[in-house]
Interface confidence: low
């Protein structure tokens, strides 16, 4: 903590300017008026403050705004944003995309994923939903940041906005997030022709149920292995060997490379070995011929 001292008269601060880089921490604490700092936040970024000096400036703002900074201050935080914790950011109410852009630019190249995720969350809350302008801003200034949102927040995305999402924006999305986004994408792209539909829906398929994957296998889509490997395990396990062969088309040979990895490994264990042999890939681990398959999960559910 910064010790409190009285400001020497010759050090009184009337403007936020370059002279402050020569102030020691305790001089900044004693001489900078928090209200003046808040009013002239836009100047802070042009001044090469040290991390220690930024700590003092943050402390000033925290004292002035214990309930959270107003957006007029947040917009001009600049590199002071690097000092903010997720707990600080949770107190904010942010509605302006200009504010979001400014802070996303600042965070670039710094390890701030938790802070950025919290900031985006506050923007979505502040704006009421994840609208097209917000998605456009995220895809332009923070590829992958869409996936930092919780499934609950993502549920506020209108299907009409899904078209603005690019494949690379979904790279870091987990199954629960794709579970939310997939039905929206299905709705958004439902009027497209088969091949065009597949191109659009492919990045979202990690959230697709078995019946939709089965339907795709009837459409000659030739799914690539990378997409197949991202499918939900639960969606892949019920597929027959014939369905997987039709789904992957010429890419079916890739199953050999992935045979030790989920979901391929789990799928192999559920297939009859003689069915697997029809692929001619030498996949091993299927159910030997002549064995009876009991679905114990059904029996347990009935007992």
């Amino acid at each position: 903590d910064v010790e409190r001292t009285t400001c020497p008269p010759e050090k009184e601060v009337h403007e936020i300017d370059e002279s402050l880089i020569f102030y020691k921490k305790r001089e900044l604490e004693a001489c900078v008026d928090a209200a003046l700092l808040a009013a002239q936040m836009d100047r802070v970024d042009a001044i090469p403050f040290t991390y220690e000096q930024l700590d003092v400036l943050k402390h000033k703002l925290d004292e002035l705004y214990p309930q959270g900074y107003p957006e007029s201050v947040i917009r001009h935080l600049g590199h002071l944003f690097l000092k903010m914790s997720p707990e600080d950011i949770r107190k904010w109410n942010v509605t302006s995309l200009e504010t979001l852009k400014a802070l996303l630019k600042v965070s670039k190249g710094h390890e701030m994923s938790a802070q950025v995720a919290t900031l985006i969350d506050r923007v979505v809350v502040g704006r009421g939903q994840l609208d097209k302008d917000t998605v456009d801003t995220l895809t332009a200034f923070c590829p992958g940041c869409l996936c930092s949102l919780s499934p609950e927040r993502l549920s506020s995305v209108p299907p009409s906005v899904i078209g603005a999402v690019r494949p690379q924006d979904l790279d870091t999305c987990g199954p629960r997030q794709l579970d939310v986004l997939y039905p929206k994408a299905r709705l958004a792209f439902q009027n497209m022709s088969g091949s065009e539909y597949f191109v659009k829906i492919r990045p979202f398929l990690g959230g697709a149920p078995t019946e939709d994957v089965k339907a795709l296998s009837q459409q000659n889509v030739s799914m690539d292995l990378a997409t197949f490997m991202k499918l939900r395990r639960e969606a892949v396990l019920p597929l027959t060997v014939a369905e997987v062969q039709k789904l992957l088309g010429p890419h079916v040979e890739g199953l050999k490379v992935e045979e030790q990895h989920s979901p391929v490994r789990d799928w192999i264990l559920k297939q009859r070995q003689d069915d697997l042999d029809t692929l001619g890939l030498g996949l091993q681990g299927g159910i030997p011929n002549g064995y009876l398959i009991l679905d114990l999960s059904v029996r347990e559910a009935l007992s």
């Epitope: 403007e15 300017d17 370059e18 002279s19 001044i47 090469p48 040290t50 930024l54 590199h79």
Partner: antibody
């Protein structure tokens, strides 16, 4: 429009002092640092120091520390640079320049100071 | 003090051609907090005061033609004039505005070939 108007050319004898003025207009004088830079004939630029017109705080290049004094008159929005114990190698054009954020965004026309016996 | 070294001392370029001026600092000008490089470029035409072109190494001052661009980071910086015009004949200076005393490079004279 930002304008910096400097005082006229001076001829001084070695050992004397010179005081160059720089009158600012078109912006809030106390909001920006004023820097002083000099340029000897046919030579490059040399930063002498700067002054915060709001507080009067100044920072000098150590090369001039014992001989230079920078002051301001807020009432007339004028900055002054006084250089004492002049020698022939101080012959130069002296510029005032307003900061834009540590860089020098606006420059005065310069004042030629000639030191000659 | 931070020493600024410019190269070349002079440069003759045909009209419409590219001119490249280099500037090297003895210490990094990259501020680890802001990720800004505290380097400016100035143009001084014969008989005139210097004029600011670029600050933060690559930010063009308003009103400066976009044929002027700055690049570089840390200790190595470049000013590029993409298509030299007659009115670009001048001496160009780099300056570090990171640590006092703020220091300038020795200047590069750009002429028409």
């Amino acid at each position: 429009e930002v304008q910096l108007v400097q005082s006229g050319a001076e001829v001084k004898k070695p050992g004397a002092s010179v005081k160059v003025s720089c009158k600012a207009s078109g912006y809030t004088f106390t909001n920006y640092w004023m820097h002083w830079v000099r340029q000897a004939p046919g030579q490059g630029l040399e930063w002498m120091g700067n002054i915060n017109p709001s507080s009067g705080d100044s920072y000098y290049n150590e090369r001039f520390m014992s001989r230079v004094t920078m002051t301001v008159d807020k009432s007339t929005s004028t900055a002054y640079m006084e250089l004492s114990s002049l020698r022939s190698e101080d012959t130069a054009v002296y510029y005032c320049a307003r900061s834009g954020g540590l860089w020098l965004a606006f420059w005065g026309p310069g004042t030629l100071v000639t030191v000659s016996s | 003090d931070i020493v600024m070294t410019q190269s070349p001392d002079s440069l003759a370029v045909s009209l419409g051609e590219r001119a490249t001026i280099n500037c090297k600092s003895s210490q990094t000008l990259l501020n680890s907090v802001s990720q800004n490089n505290y380097l400016a470029w100035y143009q001084q035409k014969p008989g005139q005061s210097p004029k600011l072109l670029i600050y933060f190494a690559s930010t063009r001052e308003s009103g400066v033609p976009d044929r002027f661009s700055g690049s570089g980071s840390g200790t190595d910086f470049t000013l590029t004039i993409s298509s030299l015009q007659a009115e670009d004949v001048a001496v160009y200076y780099c300056q570090q505005h990171y640590r006092t005393p703020y220091t300038f490079g020795g200047g590069t004279k750009v002429e028409i070939k």
